[in-house]
């Protein structure tokens, strides 16, 4: 026998209190697939998170981060503080890259300059905190 709940489309739930008819998801909830017996509570984008896409009856809200922060993790589960180019984020805040390392982004860690000599090349342009060295012939 076919499960009557399988006829319930996204945006509804199979309502056991009403002889398994399809009832609409209440506001602030959604069901993204058919045949669900409950709806899922919408994600709230609060604090450092801001709403990129509103929740609808068939899809969850999507968050991103307020200016000065960037997303980390699946579905932007965390917001991390931006730093300037030439810096990296530490437990004590944004710190300049140490000599011999660089970061050309507002996120991530400082990485060592390329060692040109490993490829038998010489340094054409010196590296900075913000830029890698440029190797030449």
């Amino acid at each position: 026998l076919q499960d009557p709940c399988s006829n319930c489309p996204a945006g509804t739930f199979c309502d056991n209190n009403r002889n398994q008819i399809c009832s609409p998801c209440p506001p602030n909830s959604f069901s993204s697939a058919g045949g669900q017996r409950t709806c899922d509570i919408c994600r709230q984008c609060k604090g450092v998170f801001r709403t990129r896409k509103e929740c609808s009856s068939t899809s969850n809200a999507e968050c991103d981060c307020t200016p000065g922060f960037h997303c980390l993790g699946a579905g932007c589960s965390m917001c991390e503080q931006d730093c300037k180019q030439g810096q990296e984020l530490t437990k004590k805040g944004c710190k300049d890259c140490c000599f011999g390392t660089f970061n050309d982004q507002k996120r991530g860690i400082c990485r060592p300059w390329t060692n040109c000599s490993l490829d038998g090349k010489s340094v054409l342009v010196n590296g900075t905190k913000e830029r890698d060295v440029v190797c030449g012939p």
Partner: nanobody, 122 residues
Framework: EVQLLESGGGLVQPGGSLRLSCAAS????????VGWVRQAPGKGLEWVSA????????YYAESVKGRFTISRDNAKNTLYLQMSSLRAEDTAVYYC???????????????RGQGTQVTVSS
């Protein structure tokens, strides 16, 4: 026992107003997420409006925005729906609804009352 008793429906001309009431017993309205759903003749249930306990955020269906206002009186344990600029398409049975949160993290809703009939016709 949780009970929801709707009242205030009736026959009204297009452009008219009504105020629906929902008297709650067996639970404290101010601690719950509640709202109004309606069922038009031959149609399925449709959410009209809701008011959420956390901060009292309100939600309205696009079709009623700017015309309907949801509110509650915590002292009277009563939920209201002020309906104005009524249209023929607002004709339906209106039910008071209470959110039901499940252990697995999902949400459904419960309508315990008989509903109140609103008919918009000239």
């Amino acid at each position: 026992e949780v009970q929801l008793l709707e009242s205030g429906g009736g026959l009204v001309q297009p452009g008219g107003s009504l105020r629906l009431s929902c008297a709650a017993s067996g639970f404290t309205l101010s601690h719950e997420d509640v709202g109004w759903v309606r069922q038009a003749p031959g149609k399925g249930l449709e959410w009209v409006s809701a008011i959420l306990d956390s901060g009292g955020s309100t939600y309205y269906a696009e079709s009623v925005k700017g015309r309907f206002t949801i509110s509650r009186d915590n002292a009277k344990n009563t939920l209201y729906l002020q309906m104005s600029s009524l249209r023929a398409e607002d004709t339906a049975v209106y039910y008071c609804a209470r959110y039901v949160y499940h252990a697995g993290g999902g949400v459904t809703f419960d309508t315990r009352g008989q509903g109140t009939q609103v008919t918009v016709s000239s």
